[in-house]
Interface confidence: medium
């Protein structure tokens, strides 16, 4: 018996070939001996089977002795043994129809689980293997689960169903709803305007939801909601914004926030959450702000940074075009009785300067100037 695998919703063509290369009498039946279709001369006749409207043949092939059964919009329950009767002989074809569907939706939030469920006919024992867009292979039986979806899991998943040494391939497009970056860090001198951007890693026709930016300032004991907003068809509207600091938000995607000025009391970490309509859970992006201040008070030149800096970052004070006077893996450095000239405060990571602030030290009878 020949075995053919089909995909739910697809069209399958079961072949039946006579030894004579001419149009002769044939008919297709199912395992219950109910006639599906056949011919009467050059006419196609259909029987009372449940396939009725979905069954067809190719009249153009009859003259060559080929009498195929075409079944459109396959259903799992179409799985059966189909019998072609022609020239006093019977050809049997076993059709097994499989379906593979994602648990709820193909648009899933980062961190959520993807469950693929295989629909299969009774009595079958298929195995499934899926390959993710990043090349990860997952094997399973009737259900296949991937926990903690990542951004790289967005794209086409290719799943192969194996049964009786035959295989059928499914392609499922999965969209992982996430921000392009899980975390970002902004370095600013005190007083500078700060731009935060939260680009999404996906595009959809309509995007509706609501979001909020919570901020944990380094100096504060608790976090504070800085802004709440709504998203309707990719249009952003601010619902509420704190009075201090007063963030401004762009009206279009990507989500864009402007902090009027970087201040030590704002330095810290924020968490932007976005709840999308008809989705359980939220998208998250962490954003960090590091603020630098260089000051001269009496005979002490000080450079400080506030915010989440890693222990490997180096803070240095140096006179322009000279070696660093002081460099420490700390959040404050100072020089007593600094020489007159343009001093630079540098925050660097493995030699790469992340933030720089200049302060002009005048001869002792003058007051300092900050450019």
């Amino acid at each position: 018996k020949k075995v053919v695998l089909g995909k739910k919703g697809d069209t399958v063509e079961l072949t039946c070939t006579a030894s004579q290369k001419k149009s002769i009498q044939f008919h297709w039946k199912n395992s219950n001996q109910i006639k599906i279709l056949g011919n009467q001369g050059s006419f196609l006749t259909k029987g009372p089977s449940k396939l009725n409207d979905r069954a067809d043949s190719r009249r153009s092939l009859w003259d060559q002795g080929n009498f195929p059964l075409i079944i459109k919009n396959l259903k799992i329950e179409d799985s059966d043994t189909y019998i072609c009767e022609v020239e006093d002989q019977k050809e049997e074809v076993q059709l097994l129809v499989f379906g593979l569907t994602a648990n709820s939706d193909t648009h899933l939030l980062q961190g959520q689980s993807l469950t693929l469920t295989l629909e299969s006919p009774p009595g079958s024992s298929p195995s499934v293997q899926c390959r993710s867009p990043r090349g990860k292979n997952i094997q399973g039986g009737k259900t296949l689960s991937v926990s903690q979806l990542e951004l790289q899991d967005s794209g086409t998943w290719t799943c192969t169903v194996l049964q009786n040494q035959k295989k059928v391939e499914f392609k499922i497009d999965i969209v992982v709803l996430a921000f392009q970056k899980a975390s970002s860090i902004v370095y600013k001198k005190e007083g500078e305007q700060v731009e935060f951007s939260f680009p999404l890693a996906f595009t959809v026709e309509k995007l509706t939801g609501s979001g909020e930016l919570w901020w944990q300032a380094e100096r504060a004991s608790s976090s504070k909601s800085w802004i709440t907003f709504d998203l309707k068809n990719k249009e952003v509207s601010v619902k509420r914004v704190t009075q201090d600091p007063k963030l401004q938000m762009g009206k279009k995607l990507p989500l864009h926030l402007t902090l009027p000025q970087a201040l030590p009391q704002y330095a810290g970490s924020g968490n932007l959450t976005l709840a999308l309509e008809a989705k359980t859970g939220k998208l998250h992006q962490e954003v960090n702000l590091v603020v630098m201040r260089a000051t001269q008070l009496q005979k002490n030149l000080t450079c400080e940074v506030w915010g989440p800096t890693s222990p490997k970052l180096m803070l240095s004070l140096k006179l322009e075009n000279k070696e660093a006077k002081v460099s420490k893996r700390e959040k404050a450095v100072w020089v007593l009785n600094p020489e007159a000239g343009m001093w630079q405060c540098l925050l660097s990571d493995s030699g790469q300067v992340l933030l720089e602030s200049n302060i002009k030290v005048l001869p002792t009878w003058s007051t300092p100037v900050q450019p």
Epitope: E190, G191, R240, Q243, K246, T258, Q261, L263
Partner: antibody, heavy 118, light 111 residues
Framework: QVQLVQSGAEVKKPGASVKVSCKAS????????IHWVRQATGQGLEWIGE????????YSNSKFKDRVTITADKSTNTAYMELRSLRSDDTAVYFC???????????WGQGTLVTVSS | DIVLTQSPASLAVSLGQRATITCKAG??????????MNWYQQKPGQPPKLLIY???NLESGIPARFSGSGSGTDFTLNIHPVEENDAATYYC?????????FGQGTKLEIK
């Protein structure tokens, strides 16, 4: 201690402009927002707008949007509020103010009386 | 804009008694457990003086005779016991949403 000292009284003709100053002392000027509020004689208080002195970002009440400009000079720790196309109903005392640790205005300037009269 | 309506417009209270001023906001000024309502006292020829912030927090240096309460849209300033020095105009102000707005004021007279 925190102090906000404003410029003196002004008399202006309708259609003219006025620029009121507010000099801050006793704290780091760039650390706090300066707000401007006005009060017509015997009337209530009306918020005009605000400025972040560090970056110069300013926001104002849409009622004054086209006529008001709020600026700050970090070198002199001074904030300015300029109101153009003056009308007689702009006659009021103009205050600058700063927040305390909470959300209210804990520090106020002494006020500047602006009289608009032909 | 959020409209704040104070009542009464004026009131006269005997020395040592309680003065109660209410402020009704056109929409809720609550967020995340806090009510963004402040109260000020103003005497003629002087700038306003902050008494209460975030509905019920007493500004430093303000006597405990002053207290604030309320949430959502309804707020109250209580002064008890009233002293002669309390004669002034009192304003509520919301710092929930731009533009910041003030109530029209309540004039307190001491009998």
């Amino acid at each position: 201690q925190v102090q906000l000292v404003q410029s003196g009284a002004e008399v202006k003709k309708p259609g003219a402009s006025v620029k009121v100053s507010c000099k801050a002392s006793g704290y780091t000027f760039t650390d706090y927002v300066i707000h401007w509020v006005r009060q017509a004689t015997g009337q209530g208080l009306e918020w005009i707008g605000e400025i972040y002195p560090g970056s110069g970002s300013a926001y104002s009440n849409s009622k004054f949007k086209d006529r008001v400009t709020i600026t700050a000079d970090k070198s002199t720790n001074t904030a300015y509020m300029e109101l153009r196309s003056l009308r007689s109903d702009d006659t009021a005392v103009y205050f600058c103010a700063r927040r305390g640790n909470g959300t209210g205005f804990a520090y106020w300037g002494q006020g500047t009386l602006v009289t608009v009269s032909s | 804009d959020i409209v704040l309506t104070q009542s009464p417009a004026s009131l006269a209270v005997s020395l040592g008694q309680r003065a109660t001023i209410t402020c009704k906001a056109g929409q809720s000024v609550d967020y995340d457990g806090d009510s963004y309502m402040n109260w000020y006292q103003q005497k003629p020829g002087q700038p306003p003086k902050l008494l209460i912030y975030v509905a019920s927090n007493l500004e430093s240096g303000i006597p405990a005779r002053f207290s604030g309460s309320g949430s959502g849209t309804d707020f109250t300033l209580n002064i008890h016991p009233v002293e002669e020095n309390d004669a002034a105009t009192y304003y509520c102000q919301q710092s929930y949403k731009d533009p910041l707005t003030f109530g029209q004021g309540t004039k307190l007279e001491i009998k």
